[in-house]
């Protein structure tokens, strides 16, 4: 029961985590305009991995995609790659873990095969979570570096001093979503790996050998011989550790210029 619960919970946590990683990757608010000095702005800038946007005080939002591949910073490309790898690994992990779930029976699949699949999906979730955390952290580091570098600079133009204030960006919501989602996927992966240990058939086969002495009728049962076949193919007397007594689970955002009301 505990194994099934651990495996099921691991799957659900990972599912939520991967959904979060996908959401974070698609979100536009990876970095948002720093409003520390000016909490109310007429033009609010924010950027994602795929496009940058402006929300005007008028209520209109306009986004512009990064239509270049070579012109983008290497770090941004790296973050994109890490997030995509995380999503792909997570998706494959989810697919594998569905078939590995103890509550789902597929033909005559061995418990040993389910254990292997659980371990595989667990590792995939762990790597997926790490990719997401790494991607988000790299982007956050890039933001911190740029934040301190972007200072207002002055230059002389027509009619005296003309000021160009470089927009400073700070952490956006997507970073926090990414960190939490990556963490959840990682936790889910660890839970799957723990569940795998419980699923693994550590067999203890007791083979009773009787020695009949002439005058006595004593049966000797030598200490159990441990099956040394790893995940074991001994179908004759197979016993799987199941954490105690259990019953089989029954669970099989432009409005038109003239928008009339």
């Amino acid at each position: 029961m505990a194994v099934t619960a651990c495996q099921g919970l691991g799957f659900v946590v990972s599912l939520i985590g991967i959904a979060g990683i996908i959401a974070a990757t698609c979100m536009d608010q990876w970095s948002t305009q720093d409003l520390y000095n000016n909490p109310v702005t007429a033009v609010f800038n924010y950027q994602g991995l795929w496009r940058s946007c402006v929300r005007e005080s008028s209520g209109f939002t306009e986004c512009r995609g990064y239509f270049t591949l070579l012109g983008l910073p290497a770090m941004l490309q790296a973050v994109r790659a890490l997030m995509i790898v995380g999503i792909v690994l997570g998706a494959i992990g989810l697919l594998v873990s569905i078939f590995a779930l103890k509550c789902i029976r597929i033909g005559s699949m061995e418990d040993s095969a389910k254990a292997n699949m659980t371990l595989t999906s667990g590792i995939m979730f762990i790597v997926s979570g790490l990719c997401a955390i790494a991607g988000v952290s790299v982007f956050a580091n890039m933001l911190v570096t740029n934040f301190w570098m972007s200072t207002a600079n002055m230059y002389t133009g027509m009619g005296g001093m003309v000021q160009t204030v470089q927009t400073r960006y700070t952490f956006g919501a997507a970073l926090f979503v990414g960190w939490v989602a990556g963490g959840l996927t990682l936790i889910g992966g660890v839970m799957m790996c723990i569940a795998c240990r419980g699923l693994a058939p550590e067999e203890t086969n007791y083979k009773a050998v009787s020695y009949h002495a002439s005058g006595h009728s004593v049966a000797y049962k030598p200490g159990g011989f441990k099956a040394s076949t790893g995940f074991g193919s001994n179908t004759k007397n197979k016993k799987i550790y199941d954490g105690g007594a259990r019953t089989e689970d029954e669970v099989q955002s432009y409005p038109s210029k003239h928008d009339y009301v």
Partner: antibody, heavy 118, light 113 residues
Framework: QVQLVQSGAEVKKPGASVKVSCKAS????????VNWVRQAPGQGLEWIGM????????RLNQQFKDKATLTVDKSTSTAYMELSSLRSEDTAVYYC???????????WGQGTLVTVSS | DIVMTQSPDSLAVSLGERATINCLSS????????????LTWYQQKPGQPPKLLIY???TRDSGVPDRFSGSGSGVDFTLTISSVQAEDVAVYYC?????????FGQGTKLEIK
């Protein structure tokens, strides 16, 4: 078609208050900010502030924070601007305008002349 | 506050000629998020409210004749009337839509020679 119709001209004594109205029609009133701009005789345009009809959220030019109060009445699709402690330098034409993309003002009211004279 | 400075203060051109009005901002009006300049041009005829001509520095509003065009980026902007007509006699204003408070240029009066 989109229309912003303002209340008529007002003559007030110094120290008095005045409330100018701006009735919107031809569009979804709660979807757009309403701006207020003033123009003193023979002078340029000066932005007073803006109000969002859906939540009565306001953005006010600091120069007018003690002068203007912006409100809306959603039921009648009307925006109001109340000017307090009037002085002779408040004599101007006051316009309401709808905000469009680029924070531009695409439709304007006909203007309300407020004259402050003793 | 962003200061908008227009030049010249007044301009007299012959019918059919080109008119150019400049607007200089004390701060860049370019939004990094969408690479648009938050500069608007208005036309105001005597006794009338201003009329929107151009927003985002170069986007003509619906119904505006194509003889009106806007250009420029960052801090330096230009309104061009390619062939001035009699009905273009008015005062032209530029406006900062980039940051609060929204500010206007002092205006440029266009007259016919």
């Amino acid at each position: 078609q989109v229309q912003l119709v303002q209340s008529g001209a007002e003559v007030k004594k110094p120290g008095a208050s005045v409330k100018v109205s701006c009735k919107a029609s031809g569009y979804s009133f709660t979807n757009y900010w309403v701006n207020w701009v003033r123009q003193a005789p023979g002078q340029g345009l000066e932005w007073i502030g803006m109000v969002h009809p859906s939540g009565s959220e306001t953005r006010l030019n600091q120069q007018f924070k003690d002068k203007a109060t912006l409100t809306v009445d959603k039921s009648t699709s009307t925006a109001y601007m109340e000017l307090s402690s009037l002085r002779s330098e408040d004599t101007a034409v006051y316009y309401c305008a709808r905000v469009w993309s680029g924070n531009a003002f695409d439709y304007w009211g006909q203007g309300t002349l407020v004259t402050v004279s003793s | 506050d962003i200061v908008m400075t227009q030049s010249p203060d007044s301009l007299a051109v012959s019918l059919g000629e080109r008119a150019t009005i400049n607007c200089l901002s004390s701060q860049s009006l370019l939004a990094s998020g969408n690479q648009r300049n938050y500069l608007t041009w208005y036309q105001q005829k005597p006794g009338q409210p201003p009329k929107l001509l151009i927003y985002w520095a170069s986007t003509r509003d619906s119904g505006v004749p194509d003889r009106f065009s806007g250009s420029g980026s960052g801090v330096d902007f230009t309104l061009t009337i390619s062939s001035v007509q009699a009905e273009d006699v008015a005062v032209y204003y530029c406006q900062n839509g980039f940051s609060f408070p929204f500010t206007f240029g002092q205006g440029t009066k266009l007259e016919i020679k």
